[in-house]
């Protein structure tokens, strides 16, 4: 899924009040949901029918810091003996996200939104082509 | 999957610098890739064996405004005829992300980070329980 | 996480009809398989039926899919149990239950429970 561009009415003050800045807003440092708590999957990703692995990126001046990348292990899928059937297809299933970056320039530290496209899994489908060559 | 809680020395500047006012930073409302050109996946959320739906909800005080969610279809999974098969499961793919929240005070305005939690797509997995009642 | 409250149980004539309703707190409901388990007094929870996440899956244990209908509302958060033709054997504490896999739901191991709403059929 893909994140819309920033409408350029969402950073601004409603029309009554003085003009901001230009180019810099305020950022509060706590986040909203923080604790929440999630669902620790059971191992979908090997009991999957189109498992994946995952490898971790990892940069001091991101948050999150790790963001975890998935990599479809097939081509096909996994059938039901255990054996990759090629008539279906392993597809990686992706979102865009956010991230926040953090800049310095000596003393100066600021802050940016940045997107990001996460592989979070895969999915197992039927192909479009049916070609026989 | 889970993202971390944010660190307390990630929104501090280098212990050399005069310290932040507590509880605020600098936004800049610019938006880091956000032209990245995302491949669109070809329908696959109806031609996976664990198919799903899709809902919008929608925030004009959130970015994205827009967060779709995932449901499956399905309790089972689709099989090579067509018909769903209970011996495997349809299980969501969630994903921890960001968000950025607007909060107004007069013409005050201030932004935070939110997580929130996205459910991608399904997945087809063995189960694990098999029990025969 | 997922907080499930069961409601609209009571004292019903056998042959009457009773709905029970089963509302959620939390995010993602949708994002979860739901259903119903019954106990009856002195017997083992019994697995009534589950409904997928968008709710176009309905299965249900073979016995009851005559006069139980098994529905839910993703916008309201909530999980019914419709129930017709009642009978004194269907005295039992319902309990609503959600997990993000069948498997584990269907055979009573779901990471989540409600408390239960009695149920008492007379004849």
């Known amino acids: 899924r893909k994140i819309p561009k920033v409408g350029h009415t969402f950073f601004q003050k409603p029309e009554s009040c003085p003009p901001v800045p230009e180019g810099s807003m305020k950022l509060d440092t706590g986040i909203i949901n923080e604790n929440q708590r999630v669902s620790m999957s059971r191992n979908i990703e090997s009991r999957s029918t189109s498992p994946w692995n995952y490898t971790v990126t990892w940069d001091p001046n991101r948050y999150p810091s790790e963001v975890v990348q998935a990599q479809c292990k097939h081509l096909g899928c996994i059938n039901a003996q255990g054996k990759e059937d090629i008539s279906m297809n392993s597809v990686p299933i992706q979102q865009e996200t956010l991230v926040l970056r953090r800049k310095h320039q000596g003393c100066s530290v600021s802050f940016q939104l940045e997107k990001v496209l996460v592989t979070v899994g895969c999915t197992c489908v039927t192909p479009v082509v049916h070609h026989v060559q | 999957r889970k993202i971390p809680k944010v660190g307390h020395t990630f929104f501090q500047k280098p212990e050399s610098c005069p310290p932040v006012p507590e509880g605020s930073m600098k936004l800049d409302t610019g938006i880091i890739n956000e032209n990245q050109r995302v491949s669109m996946s070809r329908n696959i959320e109806s031609r996976s064996t664990s198919p799903w739906n899709y809902t919008v909800t929608w925030d004009p005080n959130r970015y994205p405004s827009e967060v779709v969610q995932a449901q499956c279809k399905h309790l089972g999974c689709i099989n090579a005829q067509g018909k769903e098969d209970i011996s495997m499961n349809s299980v969501p793919i969630q994903q921890e992300t960001l968000v950025l929240r607007r909060k107004h005070q007069g013409c005050s305005v201030s932004f935070q980070l939110e997580k929130v939690l996205v459910t991608v797509g399904c997945t087809c997995v063995t189960p694990v329980v098999h029990h025969v009642q | 996480e997922v907080q499930l409250v069961e409601s609209g149980g009571g004292l019903v004539q056998a042959g009457g009809s009773l709905r029970l309703s089963c509302a959620a707190s939390?995010?993602?409901?949708?994002?979860?398989?739901v259903g119903w388990f019954r106990q009856a007094p002195g017997k083992e929870r019994e697995f009534i039926g589950a409904i997928s996440g968008s709710g176009d899956s309905i299965y249900y244990a073979v016995s009851e899919k005559d006069r139980f209908t098994i529905s839910r509302d993703n916008g309201k958060n909530t999980l019914y149990l419709q129930m017709s033709s009642l009978k004194a054997e269907d005295t039992a504490v319902y309990y609503c239950?959600?997990?993000?896999?069948?498997?584990?739901?269907?055979?009573?191991?779901?990471?989540?429970w409600g408390q239960g709403t009695q149920v008492t059929v007379s004849s």
């Open positions: 939390g995010r993602t409901f949708s994002s979860y398989v």
């Open positions: 239950t959600a997990d993000q896999e069948f498997g584990y739901l269907r055979f009573g191991r779901s990471e989540y």
